[in-house]
């Protein structure tokens, strides 16, 4: 029962992580105009995302525009885009794998196979979490590096945007959820091998073992 509870918690966390990741990737708030103390660096506030950039004028009017062409974009931005999309797709794949192996589904009947699928989904979610973490950390590193670089003009200095925090949360949730799903498996997975061991040993009397060596829980 505890195993099922952990599975549900794990998948809920990964779903939350996936939604967070989706919002993080979509929002144009990866890099935002820097503030120095309480004073804004310039009246023209800039937000930059993976897909578009926005400018909030001093009047409060906001303009956004999707990036014109893929090839004209900086390579790090292209890489971040790709990793974001791949991470989301990998997490979706993990969800499908989980659904196939979940305790409440009948896609796969065998308990061992179910356990293996849940373990696989957990690993896939962990991979998705790592893939989400890479562009977020890379972007954060670039922002911090430029912020303290005297050769970067003040107008071009940026701060960490809300999307990065969402990205970190998404990564954390995917890693945690995936980890929980991986942890639910030993209990389900260990039944299989030990069960076969017991059945094999009883059907082969030539192999003699001391009574203490048999896992007693497998005796009916």
């Amino acid at each position: 029962m505890a195993s099922a509870g952990m599975q549900i918690l794990g998948v809920v966390l990964t779903l939350l992580g996936w939604v967070n990741g989706l919002v993080s990737c979509a929002l144009p708030m990866w890099k935002v105009t820097a503030f120095i103390g309480n004073s804004i660096v310039v009246a023209q506030v800039v937000w930059e995302g993976l897909w578009m950039s926005c400018v909030v004028q001093s009047t409060g009017q906001m303009q956004c525009k999707v990036y014109d062409s893929l090839l004209a974009l900086p390579q790090d931005l292209q890489a971040a885009r790709a990793l974001c999309v791949i991470a989301l797709l990998v997490a979706l794949f993990g969800l499908l794998v989980y659904l196939a192996g979940a305790k409440c589904t009948t896609c796969v009947e065998e308990k061992d196979s179910k356990a293996r699928l849940v373990l696989t989904s957990g690993i896939v979610f962990v991979i998705s979490g790592v893939l989400t973490l890479i562009p977020v950390c890379w972007t954060a590193h670039a922002i911090i590096r430029d912020f303290y670089n005297p050769l970067v003009a003040e107008a071009q200095k940026r701060e960490l945007g809300a999307s990065l925090y969402l990205g970190w949360a998404a990564s954390g949730l995917l890693l945690l959820g995936g980890g929980l799903l991986c942890c639910t498996c030993p209990s389900g997975g260990s039944q299989g091998p030990s069960h076969y061991m017991a059945r094999y040993s009883t059907s082969a009397p030539a192999i003699s073992r001391g009574p203490s060596e048999y896992p007693t829980k497998n005796y009916v």
């Epitope: 804004i40 660096v41 310039v42 009246a43 578009m52 004209a72 970067v152 003009a153 003040e154 107008a155």
Partner: antibody, heavy 123, light 106 residues
Framework: EVQLVQSGAEVKKPGASVKVSCKAS????????MNWVRQAPGQGLEWMGE????????TYNQKFKARVTITRDTSTSTAYMELSSLRSEDTAVYYC????????????????WGQGTLVTVSS | DIQMTQSPSSLSASVGDRVTITCQAS??????LNWYQQKPGKAPKLLIY???KLEDGVPSRFSGSGSGTDFTFTISSLQPEDFATYYC????????FGQGTKVEIK
């Protein structure tokens, strides 16, 4: 219509200082950084520095840092560039230019320029 | 500091010719590069921003490409009004202009 109107030509003696003004109109002055660029006769363009009109903070080219001062007056939407300890090699046309952000490219450019102010340094 | 090496420093061409100017940065400037046209006695005019984006109102015969350290500016079919000096300008690290390329009539 965005316009940057600069002060008239100046003739200065070596060692003196010159202050060139740049009056902005047609946009929110405090919303865009103002840059200063110079061009010696028959030479290329050389960036000198920029000011954030919203805060007054400045960034200078190392080459001019000791001699240049960029200021602004938000009440008149005017930026100023003062160059001290003038030498004959400072004879040039001085331009002010607005920095703008280009949506869809994560890029900046100096999009509007003043007409230029010729400063002649001669003994 | 970033150095911008523009070449050639001057070139002679005829109306209708295809003209190519290159600009090389001493380190990567991403896509933070602009191209300007300057005519004698006039202020520079922005043609290309973000390495390849055409400024509004600029004829489509002008184009730019490149990213990182190597950039190219092209005039597909030179017109009489295109005889001028062209400058590249990086703004990844403060601002640095190339030395300029003077396009003259052959």
């Amino acid at each position: 219509e965005v316009q940057l109107v600069q002060s008239g030509a100046e003739v200065k003696k070596p060692g003196a200082s010159v202050k060139v003004s740049c009056k902005a109109s047609g946009y929110t002055f405090t919303g865009y950084y103002m840059n200063w660029v110079r061009q010696a006769p028959g030479q290329g363009l050389e960036w000198m520095g920029e000011i954030n009109p919203a805060t007054g903070s400045t960034t200078y080219n190392q080459k001019f840092k000791a001699r240049v001062t960029i200021t602004r007056d938000t009440s008149t939407s005017t930026a100023y560039m003062e160059l001290s300890s003038l030498r004959s090699e400072d004879t040039a046309v001085y331009y002010c230019a607005r920095r703008d952000y280009y949506l869809g490219s994560n890029s900046y450019a100096l999009d509007y320029w003043g007409q230029g102010t010729l400063v002649t340094v001669s003994s | 500091d970033i150095q911008m090496t523009q070449s050639p420093s001057s070139l002679s061409a005829s109306v209708g010719d295809r003209v190519t100017i290159t600009c090389q940065a001493s380190q990567s400037v991403s896509n933070n590069l602009n191209w300007y046209q300057q005519k004698p006695g006039k202020a520079p005019k922005l043609l290309i921003y973000g390495a390849s984006k055409l400024e509004d109102g600029v004829p489509s015969r002008f184009s730019g490409s490149g990213s990182g350290t190597d950039f190219t500016f092209t005039i597909s079919s030179l017109q009489p009004e295109d005889f001028a000096t062209y400058y590249c300008l990086q703004h990844r690290y403060l601002w640095t202009f190339g030395q300029g390329t003077k396009v003259e009539i052959k």
